[in-house]
Interface confidence: low
């Protein structure tokens, strides 16, 4: 997260760290007791490493009573996701067992009504992604409030040049932005999960390259079918 600040500890109990061989790789969001939603591209970077999900964390390194690392029983990328595109960049991870819920671990309601978030709406994005262009990684969860950007502006040739489909949304990226390592994390508007940070190699913090988020409402049928 660029230009953000440290989050209040355990105030986002839905927040997950998708890890490979014990290292944070991507963000994720607990959407059901046994399911974490993340970005499909995150798996590409996992290679053959052991994928696990950390829940109930604020600090990645420090012991915390609510922290628990879960093995992944099943990884389900969206069937139309491709390595060379950010389209359908969603991944559902089934935990080896139902998460132990509590004040620091709780699923987040996700948007089912397929309607664009009003441009200008302030939404919260959180993650353990880099906090500087130099690539500094935080130990504790960071977050930032970002205004939703309308699709017409986001699709300008100087911005994302028509790449933003109706199944995506954008948020402003003027110095405050999601970045590498935040992919798969939640964009939360009004207490509801609206978007998932896409995992392209986008430049961060440049207002001409807004953050791109996959709209979960557009994939309600797929999410429901996997969770069923």
């Amino acid at each position: 997260i660029l230009g953000g600040r440290e989050a209040e500890a355990h105030a986002r109990p839905y927040m997950a760290s998708v890890q490979v061989n014990g290292e944070h790789l991507c963000g994720g969001v607990l959407v059901a007791e046994q399911w974490v939603l993340s970005a499909a591209h995150c798996l590409e970077d996992a290679a053959d490493g052991k994928v696990q999900v950390l829940l109930g964390a604020h600090s990645l390194s420090q012991p915390e009573p609510s922290k628990r690392l879960y093995d992944v029983l099943r990884a389900v990328p969206h069937p139309d996701s491709r390595p060379d595109t950010i389209d359908h960049d969603l991944l559902l991870l089934q935990l080896s067992e139902k998460a132990t819920l509590g004040p620091a671990v709780r699923p987040l309601p996700w948007q089912r009504v397929d309607r664009d978030v009003e441009p200008g709406t302030l939404c919260d994005v959180a993650g353990w992604g880099i906090v500087s262009h130099a690539g500094r990684r935080p130990d504790r969860l960071q977050h930032v409030l970002l205004p939703v950007l309308d699709r017409a502006t986001c699709n300008r040739r100087t911005h994302h040049d028509g790449a933003i489909t109706q199944r995506m949304m954008c948020a402003e990226s003027n110095r405050r932005d999601s970045c590498k390592g935040d992919s798969g994390g939640p964009l939360v508007c009004g207490g509801v999960l609206e978007g998932v940070v896409t995992s392209g190699s986008r430049v961060c913090g440049n207002r001409k390259k807004p953050g791109i988020y996959t709209r979960v409402a557009s994939y309600a049928a797929w999410i429901d079918s996997v969770l069923a």
Partner: antibody
């Protein structure tokens, strides 16, 4: 296929107004801004302004403030440009464009003559 | 506003000849926002080159664009009959976006 359909030529009297439609098809109307450009006979192009169909936000070229009014009708995926208090200086072809100038309408010739 | 000056205003070229059109800006423009259009009589302008050097869809590979700062150019490596047209440069680094007066390119 992205199409921007403009109306046919207009012959108008000095002092009158004209409203030029630009009907968009082949893409989601709210996904791109609509730009308007003027081309006087045998001359270069002048940017008039642009409008964001999502929220009606408009940028005008200062030169055309008071002369041009840009609007959109989302329900019909149509952008409009109204030109008022017309003089012979306003005789020109007017184009709408979208996708940051990747797509243009066929142009509407406005002739101002008594 | 930024003034774009194109030269030459008129040019005649033989088939196979290399052609270079230039566009000079009154102040520095971002290469991301420097475009070129081709226009033939009675037709709308067509986006030809965007962001200084990127060819628009369907534009032949004999066209190229380059430049930075205040100096930009469009080059045709080998002139063909279908390239005869007017070419306009365009910037939108700053508002209002502006266009050059154009270069009319004829086949000799």
């Amino acid at each position: 296929e992205v199409l921007l359909q403009q109306s046919g030529p207009e012959l108008v009297k000095p002092g009158a107004s004209v409203k030029i439609p630009c009907k968009a098809s082949g893409y989601t109307f709210t996904d791109y801004n609509i730009d308007w450009v003027k081309q006087s006979h045998g001359k270069s192009l002048e940017w008039i302004g642009d409008i964001n169909p999502n929220n009606g936000g408009i940028n005008y070229n200062q030169k055309f403030k008071g002369k041009a009014t840009l609007t959109v009708d989302k329900s019909s995926s149509t952008a409009y440009m109204e030109l008022r208090s017309l003089t012979s200086e306003d005789t020109a072809v007017y184009y709408c464009g979208t996708g940051d100038y990747a797509y243009w309408g066929q142009g509407t010739l406005v002739t101002v003559s008594a | 506003q930024i003034v774009l000056t194109q030269s030459p205003a008129f040019m005649s070229a033989s088939p196979g000849e290399k052609v270079t059109l230039t566009c000079s800006a009154s102040s520095s423009v971002s290469s991301s926002y420097l475009y070129w259009y081709q226009q033939k009589p009675g037709s709308s302008p067509k986006l030809w080159i965007y962001s200084t050097s990127n060819l628009a869809s369907g534009v032949p590979g004999r066209f190229s664009g380059s430049g930075s700062g205040t100096s930009y150019s469009l080059t045709i490596s080998s002139m063909e009959a279908e390239d005869a047209a007017s070419y306009f440069c365009h910037q939108w680094t700053s508002y209002p976006p502006t266009f050059g007066a154009g270069t009319k390119l004829e086949l000799k």
